[in-house]
């Protein structure tokens, strides 16, 4: 089961994913893949991090624009198209056997609404899509008995479960973000 997020064609999509490094700065590898989380690793990797930084991106449209070093590994997909729709896997690769946290999020890309641009556009869109759309309880795609956990206390912060509607205001936020 996965949480759904909506973005308009041409805008930026934001797929939240985070963990709490413990102690601060003790980062773990993360991968984002197109497709639901598989048993191992990520399928169709779009972005991968190591213990220090992003080290693999399949396209310049994929970014981690949050504070990566504090565990915000939310994925931004720039200038989305209908082809970007689908399930994405965020996998937080906690050391140890079967300790990974796996989170499936679904991106729904819609065509821009044919409305006259107005200051109330974002409010109107938000009222049309009041909260998040979910297909069930979010969290790990499967429950597994973890092995002995290392010194990484993972508290996945329920992934900012608001439905994200992207309009031009997001572009302003993105333009001021630090690109890592």
């Amino acid at each position: 089961s996965e949480v759904e997020y909506i973005a308009e064609v041409g805008q930026n999509a934001y797929l939240p994913c985070s963990y709490t490094p413990a102690p601060p700065g003790n980062l773990v590898p993360v991968c984002w893949g197109k497709g639901a989380c598989p048993v191992f690793d990520c399928s169709n990797v779009v972005l991968r991090t190591d213990n220090r930084d992003v080290n693999d991106r399949t396209s310049g449209r994929y970014w981690l624009k949050g504070d990566f070093h504090k565990g915000d590994v939310s994925l931004t997909i720039e200038n989305v198209t209908l082809a970007d729709s689908g399930v994405y896997c965020c996998r937080i690769q906690i050391p140890g056997i079967m300790n990974d946290e796996k989170h499936n999020v679904k991106l729904v890309v819609i065509k821009p609404a044919k409305v006259t641009p107005a200051p109330t556009l974002q409010r109107d869109l938000t009222s049309a899509f009041p909260r998040m759309l979910t297909t069930g309880e979010h969290g790990p795609a499967e429950t597994q008995t973890p092995g002995s956990l290392p010194d990484v206390n993972l508290t996945v912060s329920n992934f900012f479960c608001e439905l994200q509607i992207f309009t031009l205001t997001n572009e302003l936020r993105d333009s001021g973000a630090t690109i890592r």
């Epitope: 497709g35 639901a36 989380c37 598989p38 048993v39 191992f40 690793d41 399928s43 169709n44 399930v87 056997i97 079967m98 499936n104 795609a141 499967e142 597994q144």
Partner: antibody, heavy 116, light 107 residues
Framework: EVQLVESGGGLVQPGGSLRLSCAAS????????MTWVRQAPGKRLEWVAN????????YYVDSVKGRFTISTDNAKNSLYLQMNSLRAEDTAVYYC?????????WGQGTLVTVSS | EIVMTQSPATLSMSPGERATLSCRAS??????LAWYQQKPGQAPRLLIY???TRATGIPARFSGSGSGTEFTLTISSLQSEDFALYYC?????????FGQGTRLEIK
């Protein structure tokens, strides 16, 4: 051409040991997950174990945990499966394969027969 | 563990015909499904992964579809070399599991 060639199979008595080898060529072996899959006579394929290259994480199906050990030697581009305390139900053709979730390509297989 | 059930167990067809093989998962595996072909005395060969993506070098007559629990492998026009054993495999849930196979034989 990507190629995997297994060796080391044979006849062994219950409780005995065998070490299977898989020689890889045609790709950068050290960057890929590698997997062992087996097929008992008349039975479906069964995933046995795999190893994450670099990180070294190793995963096993429950029925072989504590008895089988998967390993690699990147200098030799080789994958291994050390099989101890073998049982009759371990009789199968053992394949090595490249990949973590789906497998491509596969070796030709080596037959392991556990019988007294 | 996830049980993968393939049907039919045996499919008798003639060259040039369209073959449809089915695979059902005991619970949703999303699109995390692969198909393999195996000929007697040979290793399995990957045909499809991600439910519908053809592996490198696989002819266009092979196509995969489905999501969740129901999947299909279609061979649009059977060639003599297509008569073999076909397996599906899920890779969403631990452990990875395979179907029991469908034997495609010449009628």
């Amino acid at each position: 051409e990507v190629q995997l060639v297994e060796s080391g199979g044979g006849l062994v008595q219950p409780g005995g040991s065998l070490r299977l080898s898989c020689a890889a060529s045609g790709f950068t072996f050290s960057t890929y997950w590698m997997t062992w899959v087996r097929q008992a006579p008349g039975k479906r394929l069964e995933w046995v174990a795999n190893i994450k290259q670099g990180g070294g994480d190793k995963y096993y199906v429950d029925s072989v945990k504590g008895r089988f050990t998967i390993s690699t030697d990147n200098a030799k581009n080789s994958l291994y499966l050390q099989m101890n305390s073998l049982r009759a139900e371990d009789t199968a053709v053992y394949y090595c394969a490249r990949g973590s979730n789906w497998f491509d390509p596969w070796g030709q297989g080596t037959l392991v027969t556990v019988s007294s | 563990e996830i049980v993968m059930t393939q049907s039919p167990a045996t499919l008798s067809m003639s060259p040039g015909e369209r073959a449809t093989l089915s695979c059902r998962a005991s619970q949703s595996v999303y699109d995390n499904l692969a198909w393999y072909q195996q000929k007697p005395g040979q290793a399995p060969r990957l045909l499809i992964y991600g439910a519908s993506t053809r592996a490198t070098g696989i002819p266009a007559r092979f196509s995969g579809s489905g999501s969740g629990t129901e999947f299909t492998l279609t061979i649009s026009s059977l060639q003599s070399e297509d008569f073999a054993l076909y397996y599906c495999q899920q890779y969403t849930h631990w452990p990875i599991t395979f179907g029991q196979g469908t034997r495609l034989e010449i009628k």
